[in-house]
Amino acid sequence: FKVATLYSLYVCPEGQNVTLTCRFFGPVDKGHDVTFYKTWYRSSRGEVQTCSERRPIRNLTFQDLHLHHGGHQAANTSHDLAQRHGLESASDHHGNFSITMRNLTLLDSGLYCCLVVEIRHHHSEHRVHGAMELQVQTGKDAPSSCVAYPSSSQESENITAA
């Protein structure tokens, strides 16, 4: 299976909300022998591999933000803990999963990674991730709302606040 990032760069004004999105796709068994663990974390662009480092998002670790379920089931993170930090990660039935960050500040700027771990009975895990940059801007150069720049050569899009 693979993970795709719809956008590689999000540029947002301070105070706005943003939803960062990844999509995972590929063959998914209908049976109960596969589980997916999905999560989000901050990282840095490593010399060897992007997303190797796992830093917290607003003091919440990747373990705090995880989604854990079988197949393409929908799931949400623990609401109370995440929402106290202005965060929510969610997953739908179509392989999309996202993290919403509310009331952005300059400190939220950086590299964000989505991670999917495929877990099978009696097998080693299969791990894939996606990376995207968030730039939070202030002042006259800041956009009026978030602008998302696609990972491919498509034109950029304005994305509505979450």
């Epitope: 589980t35 663990y37 060897v48 373990q63 877990i119 009975h121 080693s124 895990e125």
Partner: antibody, heavy 118, light 107 residues
Framework: QVQLQQSGAELMKPGASVKISCTAT????????IEWVKQRPGHGLEWLGE????????NYNEKFKDKATFTADTSSDTAYMQLSSLTSEDSAVYYC???????????WGAGTAVTVSS | DIVMTQSHKFMSTSVGDRVSITCKAS??????IAWYQQKPGQSPKLLIY???YRFTGVPDRFTGSGSGTDFTFTISSVQAEDLAVYYC?????????FGGGTKLDIK
């Protein structure tokens, strides 16, 4: 705060079985693997295997698949390892550790000493 | 199975010294290795993950480097409390295996 509390030391007779427990607090028990690691004096660390509570997925080190059996009870957030047909080679400290999927052994229990002696 | 080899079982050093411990994997494990510290009478603790990143709360005198098959763990300025056994471990594919450990003695 994430913690793993292990059961107390055991003195066992050769041929007997022992069941060691590891109780998790401070996180969603079913979301992380519980690893089991053996340490004999002067022998370093040996991985026995792992269980993912809730799904009951297991991975065993081939060397220990006839020796160890892993179970987990999500109602009490407790993982168990049973060691069967004990011999003096099984005398060791056994650790449980937490491993989030795709990650490392980030929290360890204090260890359970098992002594096999006639 | 992937074999992790720590060439030195013992290393002796003095407070303030720089010391490096090496670990070699029997096949390419990318950067999927960790370093653990085990002090006398205690359980192991995760220090370094993904070959070069410090785990939460680990002092910056501890660093890791390497990829593929050759890895190094370094303490830039040894402190008395660093007396311990240090283990490397790969997290590339099961079975997870540990190196034999390197015992650090403080002169």
């Amino acid at each position: 705060q994430v913690q793993l509390q292990q059961s107390g030391a055991e003195l066992m007779k050769p041929g007997a079985s022992v069941k060691i427990s590891c109780t998790a607090t401070g996180y969603t028990f079913s979301s992380c693997w519980i690893e089991w690691v053996k340490q004999r004096p002067g022998h370093g660390l040996e991985w026995l295997g792992e269980i993912l509570p809730g799904s009951d997925y297991t991975n065993y080190n081939e060397k220990f698949k006839d020796k160890a059996t892993f179970t987990a009870d999500t109602s009490s957030d407790t993982a168990y390892m049973q060691l069967s047909s004990l011999t003096s080679e099984d005398s060791a400290v056994y650790y449980c550790a937490r491993r989030p999927p795709g990650w490392y052994f980030d929290v360890w229990g204090a260890g359970t000493a098992v002594t096999v002696s006639s | 199975d992937i074999v992790m080899t720590q060439s030195h079982k013992f290393m002796s050093t003095s407070v303030g010294d720089r010391v490096s411990i090496t670990c070699k994997a029997s096949q390419d494990v990318s950067t999927d290795i960790a370093w653990y510290q085990q002090k006398p009478g205690q359980s192991p603790k995760l220090l370094i993950y993904s070959a070069s990143y410090r785990f939460t709360g680990v002092p910056d005198r501890f660093t890791g480097s390497g990829s593929g098959t050759d890895f190094t763990f370094t303490i830039s300025s040894v402190q008395a409390e660093d007396l311990a056994v240090y283990y490397c471990q790969h997290q590339y594919s099961t079975p997870w295996t540990f190196g034999g450990g390197t015992k650090l003695d403080i002169k």
